[in-house]
């Protein structure tokens, strides 16, 4: 019962930490527009993977993709790539837990072949949890490193009296959300492998019980037909029924004149 | 049809106080960010103070900060301006502008209202 | 705080006539996040109150004749008048619209010859 519920309780939290990889992989909020210390703008800068938004002060957002593949930062790409694996090894992952959770029957399949896929889907989730916090980690490296440098030429003359003013970028929710659903993914899938063990099959030796009948000795051995049959003799064949009940100011969106990307 | 519509304007002594009112109709008032832009007699134009829709966010221009006050109450419709501590250089026509959808920019204004500070 | 400077300060045209007003910005008015130069130019007629005519440098408002053109970026910014026609006769503002305070220029005055 406890392995049952260290498979399903790991699965779950795979399952919140993939739904968690994926949303902050499509997040805008990956990088938004330092306030503090900095000019008072009437317009909100924000980044994600995908597209760098602007919201004005009315709550008019702008949101524009990143068109060119060759023009954007090796890193970004790196971050881009490693989230895309994160969500696609958490995806066949879950794929392979829902067959292997024991309270799930799938036609005659054995305990054995559930522990190898329980272990499969760990490793899985382990190292899709992996790759959510590196990508997100190397986000969050590029952002540091980029807010200090921004920070040591804040203004950047421009000849004269006339001076840009460099807008500045700190760790936005989606960093956040990624650390966590990494976190959580991770952890699932350490549980998994932890309900790995429970479900691999124990080496029992069984003791033959002979039933005398009248004229004829024969000896029935549990497993005797398993065996024949090509399955391991010694296979626990427990069916467990498991219930698997598992639970800014307002701003406004207006009607644009402009088309958004 | 887009209506601002302000009042309150009169003759303060130097160091008075008045509150001026704008009064909005013809749109959701409660949706719009609104601006306070002052102009002095002859003179160009100098913005005063914003507040956001749900009044989450102020800001004043350095001339009035701590001595004016921005408020709104959405339900009445109604933008106000408490003006403090009044200077001669604070005699102008106040107007109410409207933030407008797009590039942070007063796409309606008042026919405004004159305050005119004199002992 | 923004300084905005506008020249010339007055300009004298007949009808007609193409006429073309400056404005430079202390800092760059353009958001690289949208590629948006937050720039306004507003028109002010005698005994009115401001109206708005161009908003992010170069977008039209709705109801503007298209004789009004507003360009520029960065820091330096003009509008455009390609034909004045009488009602043009006013003052014309530019506002920074992207830092507070939001400051406005000192104003182009436009008459008639």
């Known amino acids: 019962m406890a392995v049952t519920a260290c498979q399903g309780l790991g699965f779950v939290v795979s399952l919140i930490g993939i739904a968690g990889i994926i949303a902050a992989t499509c997040m805008d909020q990956w990088s938004t527009q330092d306030l503090y210390n900095n000019p008072v703008t009437a317009v909100f800068n924000y980044q994600g993977l995908w597209r760098s938004c602007v919201r004005e002060s009315s709550g008019f957002t702008e949101c524009r993709g990143y068109f060119t593949l060759l023009g954007l930062p090796a890193m970004l790409q790196a971050v881009r790539a490693l989230m895309i694996v994160g969500i696609v090894l958490g995806a066949i992952g879950l794929l392979v837990s829902i067959f292997a959770l024991k309270c799930i029957r799938i036609g005659s399949m054995e305990d054995s072949a559930k522990a190898n896929m329980t272990l499969t889907s760990g490793i899985m989730f382990i190292v899709s949890g992996l790759c959510a916090i590196a990508g997100v980690s190397v986000f969050a490296n590029m952002l540091v490193t980029n807010f200090w440098m921004s920070t040591a030429n804040m203004y950047t003359g421009m000849g004269g009296m006339v001076q840009t003013v460099q807008t500045r970028y700190t760790f936005g929710a989606a960093l956040f959300v990624g650390w966590v659903a990494g976190g959580l993914t991770l952890i699932g899938g350490v549980m998994m492998c932890i309900a790995c063990r429970g479900l691999a099959p124990e080496e029992t030796n069984y003791k033959a019980v002979s039933y005398h009948a009248s004229g004829h000795s024969v000896a029935y051995k549990p497993g005797g037909f398993k065996a024949s049959t090509g399955f391991g003799s010694n296979t626990k064949n427990k069916k467990i029924y498991d219930g698997g009940a598992r639970t800014e100011d307002e701003v406004q969106s207006y009607p644009s004149k402009h088309d958004y990307v | 049809d887009v209506q601002l519509v302000e009042s309150g304007g009169g003759l303060v002594q130097p160091g008075g106080s008045r509150k001026l009112s704008c009064a909005a109709s013809g749109f959701t008032f409660s949706r719009f960010g609104m601006h306070w832009v002052r102009q002095a007699p002859k003179k160009g134009l100098e913005w005063v103070a914003y507040i956001s829709s749900g009044s989450n966010t102020i800001y004043y221009a350095d001339t009035v900060k701590g001595r004016f006050t921005i408020s709104r109450d959405n339900p009445k419709n109604t933008l106000f301006l408490q003006t403090t501590s009044l200077r001669s250089e604070d005699t102008a026509i106040y107007y109410c502008g409207r933030l407008g959808f797009y590039g942070n920019s007063f796409d309606h204004w008042g026919q405004g209202t004159l305050v005119t500070v004199s002992a | 705080n923004i300084l905005m400077t506008q020249s010339p300060s007055s300009l004298t045209v007949t009808a007609g006539e193409k006429v073309t007003m400056n404005c430079k910005s202390s800092?760059?008015?353009?958001?690289?996040?949208?590629?948006?130069?937050?720039l306004t130019w507003y028109q002010q007629k005698a005994g009115q109150p401001p109206k708005l005519l161009i908003y992010?440098?170069?977008t039209r408002e709705s109801g503007v004749p298209d004789r009004f053109t507003g360009g520029g970026s960065g820091t330096d910014f003009t509008l455009t008048i390609s034909s004045v026609q009488a009602e043009d006769l006013a003052l014309y503002y530019c506002q920074n619209s992207y830092y507070y305070p939001l400051t406005f220029g000192a104003g182009t005055k436009l008459e008639l010859k």
């Open positions: 992010w440098a170069s």
């Open positions: 800092q760059s008015l353009l958001n690289g996040g949208n590629q948006r130069n937050y």
